[in-house]
């Protein structure tokens, strides 16, 4: 695959996981009521990391938001924290990516500076796509430790007239917003990889110039207007310069121009 | 405003069928369960089911299942209750009711007196 | 099922008096995502259809008179009528709105005294 097309995968990539993120950032069901093995209740109760809802069967829904910090679980403001980090980190990287893609011409930005801002957005969506990762899994292995709790104190008996009355409690399980989670991670995780292998492609290597050095010292180089254009690439028209695969050639030029491959 | 009109009285033969209807208006009939429920002659309130006009769901009581079928017709913003092998205790005023907050039944049908008898 | 007894099965008070029908449930009908009762009231008059009063324990339908009132919570729940009318004479239920099927207790006939 070449350069362009494995650093351009490689944002589209990360730019569908970063929307997922964001998505499953938002998603209110992130945990959902279990119905399995439960008195079918006419209520569907669902939780966010933001609100908490409930949708009875009238159609009727109420939501509520967690206007509290200080009474949430530590878990769940971790689990808000590495979210809120993975989507900050994208945006810097998608924000990074864009000025480093090889199809978008900035000023007179060379192939090495595009080469590390393409390691760098790579770096950050890696890094993005582990937090949102490790969010997700950590609110599922939070809600596995409560769904067994809840089931070995699944009816809790409560003394009253005519004897025992029965409390039903609440069970939660996974809910849509873990598994658009988990994909969007690893959307993300693998976009930033893609990146990072695209920057390798793009990082000039110095036996490439030695190579093309070699060559235009070894022949008549034939003047033309524009100094060693033809030869070396490197003529006092830069205007349209571009760096393939670290050989030296230019795009407004037709003839063959040597790369390193010509010297193997 | 909002209105469940159903049909008529019946008088049945024990073994046989009836259709109740229930035409709703003045709301949007696919967003709204409707439930059905029935009171035997000096007797209290029994809720049989209920269906999702939008989507054709359904859900029994489990004492009425085999005995009732809920449908819907969202053309005609119409419920049906079909009771089959009608026997005398069967007899009863049968309600449309539709569903509000709280899942509450806050509009009525004026209810069918159905009349199981041979 | 979910079972739903009102007591008593018969009331009767003065004009102006304050009458009281309970309402116990088999199951809690509080829900925990919402903390909310699922619990309706209804009256019902000879020859008529029920009429919805309280929804969520204690919530008030508009346009039922303020003298209604729900309270309770879990399994115990309360219809109270502050200053009886004579309109006010009929059969009351309540209702499980929680778990299906949804139940409707006996029913308190209330008459005026």
């Known amino acids: 695959m070449s350069v362009t097309a494995c650093q351009g995968l490689g944002f589209v990539v990360s730019l569908i996981g970063f929307a997922g993120i964001i998505a499953a950032t938002c998603m209110d069901q992130w945990s959902t009521q279990d119905l399995y093995n439960n008195p079918v209740t006419a209520v569907f109760n669902y939780q966010g990391l933001w609100r908490s809802c409930v949708r009875e069967s009238s159609g009727f829904t109420e939501c509520r938001g967690y206007f509290t910090l200080l009474g949430l679980p530590a878990m769940l403001q971790a689990v808000r924290a590495l979210m809120i980090v993975g989507i900050v980190l994208g945006v810097i990287g998608i924000l990074v990516s864009i000025f480093a893609l090889k199809c978008i011409r900035i000023g007179s930005m060379d192939d090495s500076a595009k080469a590390k801002m393409t390691l760098t957005s790579g770096i950050l969506f890696i890094i993005s796509g582990i937090c949102a990762i490790i969010g997700v899994s950590v609110f599922a292995n939070m809600l596995v430790t409560n769904f067994w709790m809840s089931t070995a104190n699944m009816y809790s008996g409560m003394g009253g007239m005519g004897g025992m009355v029965q409390t039903v409690q609440t069970r939660y399980t996974f809910g849509a917003a873990l598994f658009v989670g988990w994909v969007a991670g690893g959307l993300t995780l693998i976009g930033g990889v893609m990146m990072c292998i695209a920057c390798r492609g793009l990082t000039p290597d110095d036996s490439n110039f030695k190579a093309v050095s070699y060559h235009a010292s070894g022949q008549n180089v034939a003047y033309r207007p524009g100094g060693f254009k033809a030869s070396t690439g490197f003529g006092s028209n830069t205007r349209n310069k571009k760096i393939y695969d670290g050989g030296a050639r230019t795009e407004d030029d037709e003839q063959s121009h040597p790369t390193k491959y010509d010297y193997v | 405003q909002v209105q469940l009109v159903q049909s008529g009285a019946e008088v049945k033969k024990p073994g046989s069928s009836v259709k109740v209807s229930c035409k709703a208006s003045?709301?949007?009939?696919?967003?709204?369960?409707i439930e059905w429920v029935r009171q035997a002659p000096g007797q209290g309130l029994e809720w049989m089911g209920l269906?999702?006009?939008?989507?054709?769901?359904?859900n029994y009581n489990e004492k009425f299942k085999g005995k009732v079928t809920i449908t819907a017709d969202k053309s005609t913003s119409t419920a049906y209750m079909e009771l089959s092998s009608l026997r005398s205790e069967d007899t009863a005023v049968y309600y449309c009711?539709?569903?509000?907050?709280?899942?509450?039944?806050?509009?009525w049908g004026q209810g069918t007196l159905v009349t199981v008898s041979s | 099922d979910i079972v739903m007894t009102q007591s008593p099965d018969s009331l009767a008070v003065s004009l102006g008096e304050r009458a009281t029908i309970n309402c116990k449930s088999s199951?809690?009908?509080?829900?925990?995502?919402?903390?909310?009762?699922?619990l309706a009231w209804y009256q019902q008059k000879p020859g008529q259809p029920p009429k919805l009063l309280i929804y969520?324990?204690?919530t008030r339908e508009s346009g039922v008179p303020d003298r209604f009132s729900g309270s309770g919570s879990g399994t115990d729940f309360t219809l109270t009528i502050s200053s009886l009318q004579a309109e006010d004479v009929a059969v009351y239920y309540c209702?499980?709105?929680?778990?299906?099927?949804?139940?409707f207790g006996q029913g308190t006939k209330l008459e005026i005294k």
């Open positions: 199951q809690s009908l509080l829900n925990s995502g919402n903390n909310k009762n699922y």
């Open positions: 969520w324990a204690s």
């Open positions: 009711a539709r569903v509000y907050y709280g899942n509450s039944f806050a509009y």
């Open positions: 269906i999702n006009p939008g989507s054709g769901g359904t």
């Open positions: 209702q499980n709105d929680y778990f299906y099927p949804f139940t």
């Open positions: 003045g709301y949007a009939f696919s967003n709204y369960l």
